[in-house]
Interface confidence: low
């Protein structure tokens, strides 16, 4: 970087700014009485080329003119776009030890003339805003380029503003700082952009517009909503707008929704009634404005108003189910369960449930309120009982839902037939069945109920259930279904006053069990051996166990073992075998089988039968 040109000057012809592809001549001249002392003839002027402050070339071979010891002219060609620095240095050839001394320097800029600006677009934000225009400048010029935006209009209105582009900033937008008022609505305005740099100038085509073409109203502000008589479905949306607005667009949606409800409102004057809102729902409201029915532009959307509509009393029917358990000869425990209403039915925060148990003939009534979704009571085993549940929020209660308490599996003739459970994928099971063959009364509905077959599941966990219409014979169960867990699935057929059920086990995905059953004892009774075992721990079963296998072989024998396969029953933990020879020592073990395969063997036990075998 040359800062002080004490020793001489550097000039460039035709100019320090040249078009791409042009050549330039750089002349370096020493001032009088400057140069190598005593030996002017030993003055050697050299020219160095720098790009991005890096020396890239010594132009010694490009000399086209030389006044020995006084001045030299160099021709430079093939300069790349942008800025190139040339530094002239004095080399005193009689003193090789001293480095060349800087004389002066010049920066040559290579660029192109500006293209005519295109795609001019002007806007005025709001009635009190100012006109701002933007344009496309075209190709980069690599030079400082000045842009002038000129506007002309009625009554000799003229206005202009300037900005420039360079390697640090881009000029493609200018705010004229003038306001067009609505009284000029029909007037036409013309804007033009002129670009100029050291290599030329160009002008855009004139761009014509009217007030309505360019004025974008400010978005509405101060948005609020008033709910009529605290209604959850009707509200009046209010807002502030600029004075000239004639058309509004409203959009609103529940916060978790993906699609907007759209409304157009003409001459709304900052007010609009909405009648289709969902109670107790978080909504987002936005409004946009326009100054003219047919022309002009819409404003940006306003800031969102987010609010929750008020509550209304619950609607809909609770889904109720129950379990009956005899306690002793004259008492039974009834456990009622119900599913929460979905938000569109609850229409508010459910504060409590009203539960009623009523004996139909004797008019005995038990009533209570609970905040839970289950309720348990002990009642007499005699009589016909009915239960009802309703949900209450701050605005009221839903209509009670009734269910008759019947003996759910009491009528064999109502038991569904050919119940099957098939794995559909990792998290659901397809249950199918056939209707009861000889039902006394019509099936009103089916209930498919399921729970995990794990210790304590009946007391710890509420059941899961699905209500199925009487003409359907299948259900896809997915709620709380996990892979590698066996579920007990019951299909109940309910008539008005009776119930029948069938049971099956099923899983959504299975593997072979991790381990086999553990043989705990082998006992000999009446010429038969009884094998007793403990079941595989629940987490190691990995699905529904279909069979147990008992293997035995003579100790030290290399023959294949014999086996006995037993249908799995949860309640069974012993089994007799009767084909073993007396006074022969046997080794016995067990495995478990799921639909995916057989487990490794459990523990081995040795036993030598004493009695007479069959």
């Amino acid at each position: 970087n040359i800062d002080v040109c004490k020793l001489g000057t550097v000039t460039v012809q035709p100019a320090p700014v040249i078009p791409l592809g042009s050549a330039a001549n750089i002349s370096c001249s020493l001032n009088p009485k400057q140069g190598c002392s005593h030996y002017p003839s030993s003055n050697e002027l050299i020219l160095l080329k720098f790009v991005n402050d890096v020396l890239v070339e010594n132009l010694h071979g490009k000399k086209v003119h030389d006044h020995t010891g006084h001045s030299s002219t160099f021709q430079v060609t093939n300069l790349s776009l942008g800025m190139t620095l040339f530094v002239c240095k004095l080399n005193c050839s009689n003193s090789q030890k001293k480095p060349p001394v800087p004389v002066c320097g010049v920066e040559i800029s290579v660029g192109v003339a500006p293209e005519p600006p295109q795609n001019i677009s002007c806007v005025q934000e709001g009635e009190n805003g100012t006109v701002a225009c933007s344009w496309n400048s075209g190709k980069v010029t690599y030079l400082k380029t000045n842009y002038t935006l000129q506007l002309s209009g009625p009554n000799n209105l003229t206005c202009q503003k300037q900005c420039f582009s360079d390697n640090r900033q881009n000029c493609n937008r200018l705010d004229l700082g003038i306001n067009l008022s609505p009284d000029l609505a029909e007037s036409r305005f013309i804007v033009r952009v002129t670009a100029i740099n050291d290599l030329g100038n160009s002008s855009s085509l004139p761009h014509t517009f009217t007030f309505l073409d360019i004025v974008i109203p400010l978005p509405p502000w101060d948005i609020r909503i008033n709910f009529l008589n605290a209604s959850g479905s009707r509200g009046t949306l209010q807002w502030e707008d600029e004075g000239q607005v004639v058309l509004n667009q409203l959009r609103y949606q529940p916060l978790n929704s993906t699609s907007w409800n759209m409304v157009n409102a003409t001459n709304a004057k900052g007010k609009y009634d909405l009648r289709d809102l969902r109670p107790f729902t978080e909504y987002e409201f936005q409004i946009s404005s326009k100054l003219h029915l047919s022309g002009g532009s819409w404003s940006n959307w306003s800031e969102s108003l987010r609010t929750r509509t008020p509550e209304e009393e619950p609607v809909g029917i609770l889904d109720i189910w129950y379990m009956k358990q005899d306690i002793d000869y004259d008492r039974q425990q009834i456990s009622l369960f119900w599913k929460s209403l979905n938000p569109s039915e609850a229409r508010g925060k459910i504060l409590h449930y009203q539960v009623t148990l009523q004996e139909v003939t004797k008019k005995t009534t038990l009533q209570n309120t609970t905040r839970h979704t289950s309720w348990t009571r002990v009642i007499p085993r005699t009589g016909a009982w009915t239960a009802s549940v309703s949900a209450a929020n701050s605005k009221g209660a839903s209509a009670p839902t009734h269910i008759n308490i019947v003996d759910l599996c009491g009528t064999g003739l109502l038991a569904p037939h050919q119940v099957s459970a098939k794995s559909e994928n990792m998290d659901n099971i397809l249950v199918t069945w056939q209707p009861p063959k000889k039902a006394d009364s019509a099936v009103r509905e089916y209930i498919v109920e399921w729970r995990a077959l794990q210790p304590g599941s009946i007391t710890k966990f509420p059941p899961h259930w699905l209500r199925i219409p009487p003409d359907n014979m299948s259900a896809l169960i997915s709620e709380n279904i996990k892979p590698y867990i066996c579920y007990e699935i019951r299909v109940h057929a309910l008539s008005e006053s009776q119930g029948g059920c069938s049971s099956i086990r099923g899983d959504s995905k299975h593997k072979a069990p991790v381990s086999g059953p553990h043989i705990t004892a082998i006992t000999e009774k009446k010429e038969r051996l009884f094998i007793s075992w403990t079941h595989i721990p629940f987490p190691e079963q990995r699905g529904c166990i279909l069979h147990y296998r008992i293997y035995w072989k003579e100790r030290d024998s290399t023959a294949q073992p014999e086996l006995c396969e037993i249908q799995y029953r949860r309640s069974q933990n012993s089994h007799p075998i009767s084909s073993l020879q007396p006074r022969v020592t046997y080794v016995l073990w067990m495995t478990a089988v799921t639909a995916a395969g057989e487990s490794p063997q459990g523990n081995e036990r040795e036993f030598c039968p004493q009695g007479k075998a069959n």
Partner: nanobody
Framework: QVQLQESGGGLVQPGGPLRLSCAPS????????MAWFRQAPGKEREVVAT????????YYADSVKGRFTISRDNAKNTAFLQMNSLRPDDTAVYYC????????????WGQGTQVTVSS
């Protein structure tokens, strides 16, 4: 005609920072190349740092590289010299200078501001 006015000089302890400002008036600042020079007692005036009209190119004397930063704010019509890790040999009168283009000699000079580095 361009007038240059420096400010920000003063007494500072060794290792401390100082920020000089230069505000030109009289013509469009954004087309001027700017520089800071200094002159210590009994020594010649020397260039400290320069910056092109766009701010795209800067130059620093070897003695200040890594410690001093030259910058400009075309919107505020001001050039700055941020001086960090000052040393006693930085003591001098600091001058702001300007020229019409990014080459040639400096045409406009300020009156200077004294910077003294001493404990």
């Amino acid at each position: 005609q361009v007038q240059l006015q420096e400010s920000g000089g003063g007494l500072v302890q060794p290792g401390g920072p100082l920020r000089l400002s230069c505000a030109p008036s009289g013509r469009t600042f954004s087309t001027l190349a700017m520089a800071w020079f200094r002159q210590a007692p009994g020594k010649e005036r020397e260039v400290v740092a320069t910056i092109s009209w766009s701010g795209g190119r800067t130059y620093y004397a070897d003695s200040v590289k890594g410690r001093f930063t030259i910058s400009r704010d075309n919107a505020k019509n001001t050039a700055f010299l941020q001086m960090n890790s000052l040393r006693p040999d930085d003591t001098a009168v600091y001058y702001c200078a300007a020229r019409e283009s990014d080459y040639g000699s400096y045409d406009y000079w300020g009156q200077g501001t004294q910077v003294t580095v001493s404990s």
